[in-house]
């Protein structure tokens, strides 16, 4: 069970875009080409932005989350990939408290980026109302930032 207090909140997001740093036994079932990854990210991007904008407009006054804990781009020379396994549990957890249909589409796309044999962590919602809203906001903000980072990297890398 993942704790949502302090720095541990984004423990799984540390793996967001670091496929190239992971051991070979965690390699994706089907290694996607950069063009495939770009296509998935371009599908995820408007959904992620829409969810974030919608949530921010509903939850006025929530503080901006700190993005610094999300090292999306690996320093490896290979192109980074989003680790769907790391992010999926978060979206599964927030689905009942968010736009069901958009989250379903995000889950479908993230599933394509899932890692083979990687155990999925269990993510539970914080009980405190303010903490929970912050948690959802942070997930959406961090995910949007992650997508932007990877897209930037893919666009500047070899086609």
């Amino acid at each position: 069970m993942l704790s949502h207090a302090g720095p541990a909140r984004f423990a799984l997001f540390l793996l967001c875009c670091m496929e190239t740093l992971l051991p070979s036994h965690m390699a994706p079932t089907h290694r996607l080409q950069p063009s495939d990854v770009r296509k998935i990210i371009l599908e995820l991007r408007p959904m992620s932005k829409g969810l974030l904008q919608d949530y921010v407009s509903k939850e006025i006054g929530l503080p901006e989350s700190n993005h610094s804990s999300l090292p999306c781009l690996s320093s490896d020379s290979q192109l980074p990939h989003i680790n769907g396994s790391a992010i999926l549990p978060y979206f599964r957890a927030i689905r009942p408290l968010s736009d069901k249909n958009t989250i379903d589409k995000i889950i479908e796309q993230l599933d394509k980026l899932k890692f083979q044999r990687e155990p999925e962590a269990e993510v539970s919602m914080p009980a405190d109302n303010f903490e929970r809203k912050n948690f959802i906001l942070a997930v959406l903000q961090q995910f949007s930032a992650c997508l932007e980072h990877v897209l930037q990297s893919l666009n500047s890398g070899p086609q």
Epitope: P96, D104, I107, E108, M125, N129, R132
Partner: antibody, heavy 121, light 106 residues
Framework: QVLLVQSGAEVKKPGASVKIFCKAS????????INWLRQAPEQGLEWMGW????????KYNETFKGRLTLTADTSTNTVYMELSSLRSADTAMYYC??????????????WGQGALVTVSS | EIQMTQSPSSLSASPGDRVTITCRAS??????????MHWYQQKPGQPPKLLIY???NLESGVPSRFSGSGSGTDFTLTISSLEPEDAATYYC?????????FGQGT
Amino acid sequence: QVLLVQSGAEVKKPGASVKIFCKASGYSFTYYDINWLRQAPEQGLEWMGWIFPGDGGTKYNETFKGRLTLTADTSTNTVYMELSSLRSADTAMYYCARGGTSVIRDAMDYWGQGALVTVSS
Amino acid sequence: EIQMTQSPSSLSASPGDRVTITCRASESVDNYGISFMHWYQQKPGQPPKLLIYRASNLESGVPSRFSGSGSGTDFTLTISSLEPEDAATYYCQQSNKDPLTFGQGT
């Protein structure tokens, strides 16, 4: 698109068991609960239980405890519902329906077409 | 278990009418700041179809004449302007606590 396809109608004798399936397609099967419900002729809906295919976890309505078994086969994206010790009151349309993705139960947004089970001597 | 009581049990109305169905839960179905109350439509010989989820969210593909409101224990499904194809049985359902329970239908 999301589809839940159920097996066909069954006629059973009292005391027998019935096993019906629900084959899912069009979504990531392991991340969503599958609920089972039934509806007796001209009656309302009764929830029987759910299974989470990702880990095989189940929750049964106390009404069916000991008689109901839900299983999932992730290789074929199929969920099975087995009801034993059938009695005439079990005559109903049995539905599978997709639920939520977390421990917080959610709405059932896609339903199978239903499987009619008739219990008669 | 949470008991769900729908009213009326049946109603007759004409095309263009505004129709309201209410559902009362025996205890609050609110959690995490959200009402886990859902509405379904069922036509003869068909499975139920989700109309409204979490009290007020319109399911994708459902006409905007359907709306839901309420929180805690009291909820309402409204059809703003009735169409002939809306003839059906409507069920409310709570998912806040197992066992999941339904209203008796309208």
